[in-house]
Interface confidence: medium
């Protein structure tokens, strides 16, 4: 007789992550008896929902229902129909809508309210749509890393799962950039947690972890490149910003009222005698890094050493994990190389910004113009901020490991805010059972 | 045409459950979501939860959130709401109303059932 | 929760008078909002939602008005058949909450 296949015991989780540009939907699969297990959970399936982040559905919440469909539907086709009620669905809100809530605490529990209705009209056992906290945002970034790259499990491997993988328990530093924040969060090495704010402690699998993490609002690449536009635009002497973040020969209006829509550029908002100006590039990596450092205020600092903007960070220690936007853009500039040099990056870039606004749509034509245009002061940015800002140096800059995915599972928060909700990550390590690997008949 | 038709009045002891049914006809069962809202005698209206009935999911008033449980059956298009742990405050009638789902402005109540009364005595 | 606060609690009039009710949220609603009409040992009918749309059926003499966070019910010209206790109802927040009725009297 023929061995009929058992049926596959698993479970599935989903985490829509609802961006400030735009939202993707992550379904996660694991063993149903290897649960507390360390890295058996992984992505099955990502589904970017096309158009922007909800925070732009504000004046048309409406539509949220139609924009969450074609991923809610694709997640009802991955998963097995048998699974449907058992999967749990989570949506996490980050900065786009701490923005929006910072703006109106009315506006964002308004498009809340439309997206838990949305969502809670599928098979799934839906459970909330909320705003994360920076902190929560960080945090979960660290473990889903160090949980991907094995760090939490006690059996050190003989062998490597991934290229920059040591083999030593030490985890991971990580370090997220989104369009309307960044964070960046990792443990210290014997230091002081300054600021309560900054401090984490958590017990996972047996071993207690001091972590540092911070989130900086506004300082995401889309936030800070509004930032630096409403900076700069203060001393232009008319509607003409001749901007060295752009490619030379590249044009583009921008309305003052779409500037100065955003929390994010109050600081430097003035009354203008026009209602519109035309950016105008002239592609200078070095002026360009000059404007994005204003940004940074490193004048004052109440700790014994801080990031910017008076915020503490204590020294760098380990490997870092880049991932979400910092992966993207280097990945777009071919800089993710482990190979490169801070030096060599910087060159690059140099190289990358000077060049003719039109050469570079000739180069890649298949590339959206609004997302083209921007990853001379995205590329210029992170290098800014990674240096300036994190005060990484030319010699710590090969710890610093460029991350798109690990083991097939994409690197950021939203798997780590699933193992924190699903209870999948003990405080204890677990006790192996001699049925856990093998049956015996 | 559209209606809801609920079971019928229960008279129940304290510490006891009541289950009542709304049964749903001239429209499509999923489309809509189901309220249930009680009143007591003399006094106004008050929600005790939700649920999608293409999902099951459900939404509590925080008040009565570990005592009522909302449930359907698809395959009837019938909506049920089970009450434990009656207390005598618990005595009043127990509406079904339907709300549209896709349209925030749908939202509102536009059809309700003739209402259930339960009373809990002892 | 948004807290719906509706007043009078009770009033009496005179057939054909002008009737007015209004319903104030603790936060702006953004016209979300419905209008019902309860007689004794019924259900609630709906007779307005989102603030001024008239259900069909519902004569023209009942009519609605308002915005952000103040809202207006008003009977322009008072019918026996109309005597019965009135409530709003805000569908702003998925946590829908209630007026706490009007009882309208003939006098």
């Known amino acids: 007789t023929q061995n009929k296949a058992l049926p596959e015991n698993v479970k599935y989780g989903i985490v829509l992550d609802a961006g400030s540009s735009h939202t993707s939907l992550y379904i996660y699969k694991w063993p149903a008896e290897k649960e507390n297990d360390t890295g058996v959970v992984h992505q099955v399936e990502e589904c970017r929902v096309k158009g922007p982040g909800i925070s732009k559905f504000v004046q048309k919440v409406n539509e949220i229902g139609i924009y969450l469909t074609d991923c809610m539907e694709r997640a009802r086709e991955v998963i097995p129909r048998s699974q449907h009620q058992e999967t749990p669905v989570y949506l996490g809100a980050t900065a786009g809508m701490r923005l929006l809530r910072m703006e109106s605490e009315e506006l964002a529990d308004r498009v809340l309210d439309v997206v838990e209705r949305s969502l809670s009209n599928y098979p799934f056992d839906f459970q909330g749509a909320r705003i994360i906290t920076g902190q929560e945002e960080g945090a979960y970034g660290w473990i889903t890393i160090n949980y991907l790259l094995g760090k939490f499990s006690q059996k050190t491997r003989w062998f490597s799962i991934v290229p920059y993988e040591t083999n030593n328990q030490e985890t991971f530093g990580a370090l997220d950039l989104g369009g309307a924040s960044t964070q960046v969060t990792f443990v210290p090495q014997n230091q002081t947690i300054e600021s309560p704010d900054n401090a984490l402690q958590f017990r996972l699998y047996g071993k207690d972890y001091n972590v540092y993490t911070h989130s900086f609002l506004c300082y995401g690449k889309d936030q800070a490149l509004w930032q630096k536009l409403a900076k700069d635009i203060q001393v232009a002497s008319n509607e003409i910003l001749r901007d060295p973040c752009f490619h030379p020969g590249y044009k583009k209006v921008v309305n003052v009222s779409d500037l100065y829509k955003t929390p994010c550029t109050k600081r430097f908002e003035m009354t203008l005698p026009f209602q519109q100006f035309e950016i105008q590039g002239i592609g200078n990596y070095q002026q360009c890094h000059q404007s994005i450092l204003e940004l940074f205020n490193t004048s004052y600092c109440p700790y014994s050493q801080c990031a910017f903007n008076g915020i503490f960070l204590p020294p760098l220690q380990g490997d870092f994990g880049a991932f979400s936007a910092f992966y993207f853009v280097m990945k777009f500039l071919n800089l993710t190389s482990e190979k490169v040099s801070q030096e060599k990056v910087t060159e690059m870039m140099k190289k990358f910004c000077a060049q003719p606004w039109e050469e570079i749509k000739t180069s890649y034509a298949g590339v959206k113009e609004k997302y083209l245009s921007e990853y001379c002061f995205s590329g210029t940015y992170i290098l800014s901020l990674l240096l300036q800002g994190y005060h990484f140096t030319a010699d710590s800059w090969e710890h610093i490991h460029f991350i798109g995915k690990i083991q097939g599972s994409d690197a950021g928060w939203t798997l780590g805010y699933m193992l924190n909700l699903t209870n999948m990550i003990p405080a204890e390590q677990p006790l192996s059972t001699p049925l856990s690997h093998s049956t015996y008949v | 045409q559209v209606q809801l038709v609920q079971s019928g009045a229960e008279v129940k002891k304290p510490g006891a459950s009541v289950k009542v049914s709304c049964k749903a006809s001239?429209?499509?069962?999923?489309?809509?979501?189901m309220y249930w809202v009680r009143q007591a005698p003399g006094q106004g209206l008050e929600w005790i939860g939700r649920?999608?009935?293409?999902?099951?999911?459900?939404k509590y008033n925080e008040k009565f959130k570990n005592r009522a449980t909302l449930t359907v059956d698809t395959s009837i298009s019938t909506a049920y709401m089970e009450l434990s742990r009656l207390r005598s405050d618990d005595t009043a009638v127990y509406y079904c109303?339907?709300?549209?789902?896709?349209?925030?402005?749908?939202?509102?109540?536009?059809?309700w059932g003739q209402g259930t009364t339960v009373t809990v005595s002892s | 929760d948004i807290q719906m606060t509706q007043s009078p609690s009770s009033l009496s009039a005179s057939v054909g008078d002008r009737v007015t009710i209004t319903c104030k949220a603790s936060?702006?609603?953004?016209?979300?909002i419905g209008w019902y009409q309860q007689k004794p040992g019924k259900a609630p009918k709906l007779l307005i939602h989102?603030?001024?749309t008239l259900q069909p059926g519902v004569p023209s003499r009942f009519s609605g008005s308002g915005s952000g966070r103040d809202y207006t019910f008003t009977i322009s010209s008072l019918q026996p058949e109309d005597i019965a206790t009135y409530y709003c109802?805000?569908?702003?927040?998925?946590?829908?909450?209630f007026g706490q009725g009007t009882k309208l009297e003939i006098k």
């Open positions: 109802l805000q569908y702003h927040a998925l946590l829908f909450t």
């Open positions: 649920i999608a009935p293409s999902s099951g999911a459900t």
């Open positions: 001239g429209y499509t069962f999923t489309n809509y979501w």
């Open positions: 936060q702006d609603i953004n016209k979300y």
């Open positions: 109303a339907r709300s549209g789902i896709y349209y925030d402005y749908d939202w509102f109540f536009d059809v």
């Open positions: 989102y603030t001024s």
